[in-house]
Interface confidence: medium
């Protein structure tokens, strides 16, 4: 992407000056002068530079992700865009730069216990006897192997609760689903009066933990029906 080209550290990630990727004939996109990319940065024009066409994040370099260059643009045209730095908005982990991950729609720093700064290949150890660490292409898209076995931690993108670590459930947050903590005793919970009504929630809560159920808080019995507060209580 344009800013990875401008970044002196990313010279090894330079896409070909002309032509697209194998398997994407004719899908190269010309960079318009001063085009504004979703990352929110304006770039200079680079002679002969063509953004790299892609279908998936894994086809881009470590400091890139695959997306349509314009918000709401032609979904059929996707190129490798610069990864988003800390505190920028995101929709998935691959959008965030190495060393960061997407939590609650924002790129945040990965601590040692979270993601290990990798794209797919989390082989940060050395191979053979050369003690070389992974090159720049091997740093961003998956959880580290430790994460595979411990499952998704809080804030990890998920599809179902079984993707999340113990004590977490998979719940909606904005446009995606992330691992959130299962509710503890006394915490506010959501009691769905109509089956399927949880589908309307933008910020979905987890269910109550083992031995707890979502019930009206005792001192709220007198409150009007609509404002009743539910909390997780012992059976």
């Amino acid at each position: 992407t344009l800013n990875s080209v401008l970044n002196s550290n990313a010279i090894k990630n330079l896409p070909p000056p002309l032509g697209g990727a194998a398997g994407h004939p004719g899908s190269a996109v010309s960079a318009a002068p001063g085009i504004l990319y979703p990352g929110g940065n304006k770039y200079q024009t680079i002679d002969n530079y063509q953004p790299y066409p892609c279908a998936e994040d894994e086809e881009c370099g470590t400091d890139e992700y695959c997306a349509s260059p314009t918000r709401g643009g032609d979904a059929g045209v996707q190129i490798c865009l610069a990864c988003r730095k800390r505190r920028k908005r995101c929709m998935r982990h691959a959008m965030c730069c190495p060393g960061n991950y997407c939590k609650n729609g924002i790129c945040v720093s990965s601590d040692q216990n979270h993601f290990r700064g990798e794209i797919e290949e989390t082989i940060t150890e050395s191979f053979g006897n050369d003690h070389s660490t992974l090159d720049g292409y091997s740093r961003r898209t998956t959880l580290s192997s430790k994460m595979y076995h411990t499952k998704g931690q809080e804030g990890s993108v998920c599809l179902r609760s079984s993707d999340c670590a113990s004590g977490l459930c998979c719940a909606r947050h904005f446009w995606s689903k992330i691992c959130k903590p299962v509710l503890k005793e006394g915490q506010v919970c959501t009691k769905h009066r109509r089956k399927g009504s949880h589908g309307l929630e933008i910020f979905q809560r987890c269910y109550c933990g083992e031995g707890l159920s979502c019930r009206i808080q005792k001192d709220h019995h007198q409150a009007s029906n609509s404002s009743r507060l539910h909390t997780c209580q012992r059976h």
Epitope: K12, P15, P16, G19, A21, A22, G23, Y52, E56, D57, E58, E59, C60, G61, T62, R92, H93, A94, Y101, F115, I119, E120, E121, T122, I123, T124, E125, F127, G128, S132, T133, L134, D135, G136, Y137, S138, R140, T141, T142, L143, S144, S145, M147, Y148, H149, K151, G152, S156, V157, C158, L159, D163
Partner: antibody, heavy 121, light 116 residues
Framework: EVQLLESGGGLVQPGGSLRLSCAAS????????MGWVRQAPGKGLEWVSG????????VYADSVKGRFTISRDNSKNTLYLQMNSLRAEDTAVYYC??????????????WGQGTLVTVSS | DIQMTQSPSSLSASVGDRVTITCTSS????????????LAWYQQKPGKAPKLLIY???KVASGVPSRFSGSGSGTDFTLTISSLQPEDFATYYC????????????FGQGTKVEIK
Amino acid sequence: EVQLLESGGGLVQPGGSLRLSCAASGFTFRRYVMGWVRQAPGKGLEWVSGIYPSGGSTVYADSVKGRFTISRDNSKNTLYLQMNSLRAEDTAVYYCAKDRYSQVHYALDYWGQGTLVTVSS
Amino acid sequence: DIQMTQSPSSLSASVGDRVTITCTSSQSLFNVRSQKNYLAWYQQKPGKAPKLLIYDTSKVASGVPSRFSGSGSGTDFTLTISSLQPEDFATYYCSSRDNSDNHLVVFGQGTKVEIK
């Protein structure tokens, strides 16, 4: 058209060395993970080694670790496999393969025709 | 290390048959971060190089007929040929990558599809 052409196979004695080459064309070589897969006569496929785009990171099957070295020359669009301390069980057709991805090694979408390596005294 | 087990190891079928091959991995292939199961299927004919049929569990590779499809998640995966054609008689391999720090690539032992 994507093409991968292996060379360097042949007959070698146990303990000997051989260097396989794979000349790539028809795609942007420097952007993709590349790998070597072998197939012993009458047997199934066995992955040997993989190398990521800039060449700085490599992975090996346990059976060849410490004996084989994978490398690439992006300026020449060529992939290499240096095989040392060869054993009879290394006898196989060796395929060079291109991965579909730049960052994930496993989906090999283009393969060479293979080169036969025979280790025998 | 991860192991990939295919079944059956061989099968006999007729042209037009629906054929299903299964592949079971010794550990989950689901990748929480990329939201994918990294599993591929290859076809190999005698004396020829393997050909990628399916990747990411269900995506059909370029130039592969639509009668080939893949499904599954976690540890259990399936390759289906909806209506077997004469050119489909071959050996099929599933493949994935180890979830250990090394991300080694592993192949199943293969399933030979023969003419009944």
